[in-house]
Amino acid sequence: PASLAGCYSAPRRAPLWTCLLLCAALRTLLASPSNEVNLLDSRTVMGDLGWIAFPKNGWEEIGEVDENYAPIHTYQVCKVMEQNQNNWLLTSWISNEGASRIFIELKFTLRDCNSLPGGLGTCKETFNMYYFESDDQNGRNIKENQYIKIDTIAADESFTELDLGDRVMKLNTEVRDVGPLSKKGFYLAFQDVGACIALVSVRVYYKKCPSVVRHLAVFPDTITGADSSQLLEVSGSCVNHSVTDEPPKMHCSAEGEWLVPIGKCMCKAGYEEKNGTCQVCRPGFFKASPHIQSCGKCPPHSYTHEEASTSCVCEKDYFRRESDPPTMACTRPPSAPRNAISNVNETSVFLEWIPPADTGGRKDVSYYIACKKCNSHAGVCEECGGHVRYLPRQSGLKNTSVMMVDLLAHTNYTFEIEAVNGVSDLSPGARQYVSVNVTTNQAAPSPVTNVKKGKIAKNSISLSWQEPDRPNGIILEYEIKYFEKDQETSYTIIKSKETTITAEGLKPASVYVFQIRARTAAGYGVFSRRFEFETTPVFAASSDQSQIP
């Protein structure tokens, strides 16, 4: 029979072209891509492959070794001169490892029939590949009808005698896929029908989408689907110290490529992304939320000595409101307002000042006015009370001026203008205010209310009274108006610097009406209500000291 090389050599001995071919093949052995998982690679099997040839004089194994003395498993057949060839080569059982679609990569050489003398009628340039699924590792048989044909394999490049002479080896690589597979494993079979072939390597593999970390989500090794157009949706799991709003998913294509990412993971508060992992924020740095990209330095006047901080601690005497974001500097209450001036207009006071030198680092500075009424003699002050009105308001003032109205006249007041901000209520420290002392102008006094009768005689009446409740200044004198009852048009006026008088020249047993008013530098107040007193009869004893209600 014709040998593969077209030259005759001893039986079972590898012809020259095989040696040349194998040397070339060995130099080009490449590692499989990361998305391919080998189920069988004849090049890497160290011992016997355990394949069966049927009939025995068909396919034959050529025993060669590489430079490391590892066996090279090559099968050849070249019965081109004989008719009706039906030579089978069966692999051992191959586990599919859960894959439902597998790939078979064949590396082989094929002799050009035209380059062979004679045998043109019987020489073929193709061979067939079959498979048979089985759960049983010992289920190998050679019932041809049980094997399912995968394809007829033809060479893209066939070689001639001339190629041998030039030492040019034309190694063909053909890949076919099979699926869907439903059993644990399968056998492959190669059928020769009269070609001159050397099967240099058989690699069976499935494709997977290799485990990957994308957007801080770990996607596991995923075996591709059975359908060549199928996309498998795969859920990812967030890496340590990361969280997600939208669970991460990706799609594994039939080619073993990850496509169409959905969702992502984010490093949780206190951690930041570095090299695809979530690293702890170191002391002095913080991250308040997963949605923030990286750890940031503590803002001014704050610190953290912890790892994985989500906020920083305010320094002594500095504060943070609950509503302040953790990225905002810690702040403190403002210093006192400055350069306060007052302007008194009768019973109104206008105050003006300039803002504090130190706002405490905040923009929400406002002012509060505390009003105190002071007794100039005792030096004691008390709250002003509710009768005072503040324009525009007493607290929460944004402008640096305020007007107080409805004050008491001729009264000493102390106004405390306090600067406050958003953290003033958090600070245990002393209030920061500037004081202004003012005295309101004098005004006409209020009416005299409390009048007592003194000695009453037949021709005179003695009266005493108390200063008005609101003198509104220094009482310069009192004016007493009196007349006989029902004789209002004929009245008498007496002036007194004291709070007592005696009206004389009165008729006995007559009723007299008295009204009293006080005067300050601002003028007279209104007269008091009418007080009625009666002189005694001619012969009666005089009365004394009874109070008129």
Epitope: R282, P283, G284, F285, K297, C298, Y303, H305, E306, E307, A308, V313, E315, K316
Partner: antibody, heavy 120, light 111 residues
Framework: EVQLVESGGGLVQPGGSLKLSCAAS????????IHWVRQAPGKGLEWVAS????????YYADSVKGRFTISRDNSKNTLYLQMNSLRAEDTAVYYC?????????????WGQGTLVTVSS | DIVMTQSPDSLAVSLGERATINCKAS??????????MNWYQQKPGKAPKLLIY???NLESGIPDRFSGSGSGTDFTLTISRLEPEDAAVYYC?????????FGQGTKLEIK
Amino acid sequence: EVQLVESGGGLVQPGGSLKLSCAASGFTFSTFGIHWVRQAPGKGLEWVASISGASTTIYYADSVKGRFTISRDNSKNTLYLQMNSLRAEDTAVYYCARYGTSFPYGLDYWGQGTLVTVSS
Amino acid sequence: DIVMTQSPDSLAVSLGERATINCKASQSVDYDGDSYMNWYQQKPGKAPKLLIYGASNLESGIPDRFSGSGSGTDFTLTISRLEPEDAAVYYCQQSNEDPFTFGQGTKLEIK
């Protein structure tokens, strides 16, 4: 006023144990990292251990790892250093020091130190 | 561990003169644009005192004749006009990574 006061030092035999304390006052103890630093007689400073305010982060020098334990009781404003399997080379003045608040932090307040002598 | 090496081991400088102490780290002590380098002063029988933090920041209450400079692995402490009370041992310390290592110290004497 910030104050750190160490106590618990003394003479101990090799292989023995000792527990140092550091009483803190004048600051919010629970928010501050505190360190132990030691100084052998006539030698330089050697950092020993540190603990964060919430005790979540603890570090030791290789020379004391497995033998010394740093801890704190924030309710008592006190830091501790439990020293076991003491060796002659552990003889030193032990200082506690507060991690500062100005970034990047240094050790801004130190105690007066307590002397530990390991000798037979 | 990061090894801190100070130079010189000791120096004597006249009053009013400038004193310079160097510190070299076996690897960079910088992180995110800041240098984690501190300088301390220690007088006999006393606890160390922080002078400079973050390579160049003067600690509160320290006279401004003290200054620090440098980044990465090379740092310098400078005392611009030496005063009698500046006689002490000076230590550099890195706080970039655990363990926080100190230099061996430099003894400064008044000439």
